[in-house]
């Protein structure tokens, strides 16, 4: 015999108190799959948590974090405080990146500057706490007579033919 509850679609529940007919989920609850015997309570986004998506009869609410915090964990179960760019969050709070490292975001850890010489390149722009170094051409490309960049042809004055 087929379970009569299997006919109940998402957004409803199989109501045992009413001969297993499909009843709509009550307010502030949802069922995301069919055949459910109960509806789940909607998540409430309170405090540091802001509503990103409202709860509907078929899907839970989704939260994100208020400015100054960012989501951690599955489904944004926690909000971790931001640091400034050029910092990382340690056991003792937000700390500046050590020399030779950078963080261009408000979260995450400080990462080492790119070592341009590993790719045979030179440093074009020095790194900072907030920005990685910018690597330029290899030192060999910068030696006299070895320019890889073709200079533009000199402009000819009107009325002069080429030599």
């Amino acid at each position: 015999l087929q379970d009569p509850c299997s006919n109940c679609p998402a957004g409803t529940f199989c109501d045992n108190n009413r001969n297993q007919i499909c009843s709509p989920c009550p307010p502030n609850s949802f069922s995301s799959a069919g055949g459910q015997r109960t509806c789940d309570i909607c998540r409430q986004c309170k405090g540091v948590f802001r509503t990103r998506k409202e709860c509907s009869s078929t899907s839970n609410a989704e939260c994100d974090c208020t400015p100054g915090f960012h989501c951690l964990g599955a489904g944004c179960s926690m909000c971790e405080q931001d640091c400034k760019q050029g910092q990382e969050l340690t056991k003792k709070g937000c700390k500046d990146c050590c020399f030779g490292t950078f963080n261009d975001q408000k979260r995450g850890i400080c990462r080492p500057w790119t070592n341009c010489s590993l790719d045979g390149k030179s440093v074009l722009v020095n790194g900072t706490k907030e920005r990685d170094v910018v690597c330029g051409p290899s030192p060999a490309d910068l030696s006299p007579g070895a320019s890889s960049v073709t200079p533009p042809a000199p402009a000819r004055e009107p009325g002069h033919s080429p030599q």
Partner: nanobody
Framework: QVQLVESGGGLVQPGGSLRLSCSAS????????MSWVRQAPGKGLEWVSD????????FYEDSVKGRFTISRDNAKNTLYLQMNSLRAEDTAVYYC?????????????????WGQGTLVTVSL
Amino acid sequence: QVQLVESGGGLVQPGGSLRLSCSASGFTFSSYAMSWVRQAPGKGLEWVSDINSGGESTFYEDSVKGRFTISRDNAKNTLYLQMNSLRAEDTAVYYCAKHPLTYTIATMNDYDYWGQGTLVTVSL
């Protein structure tokens, strides 16, 4: 070991004020967000307020906004809840709770340590 001990509850008339304290020990208090949660007689737990580790960010349940103020003194390892304009519906056991990760605010389900609670009764 982590300990949270609330105090300051009592009987107060409607419109009155109380200040709850929560003394913390056994962890680096200044690194953790803290919360107040309450349980009215015969009801479930209700989140009241959060404060981040440094004390500069505070959050409140709608029903207490403008009446309650959460604060902390990291030098004294103490959390506070100043409750003004108290109403009968504020009657509850008030618990302080610690969040599980440093510099992070969690949902109530994830708080890892709770105090034993202090009873606040608002009645004539």
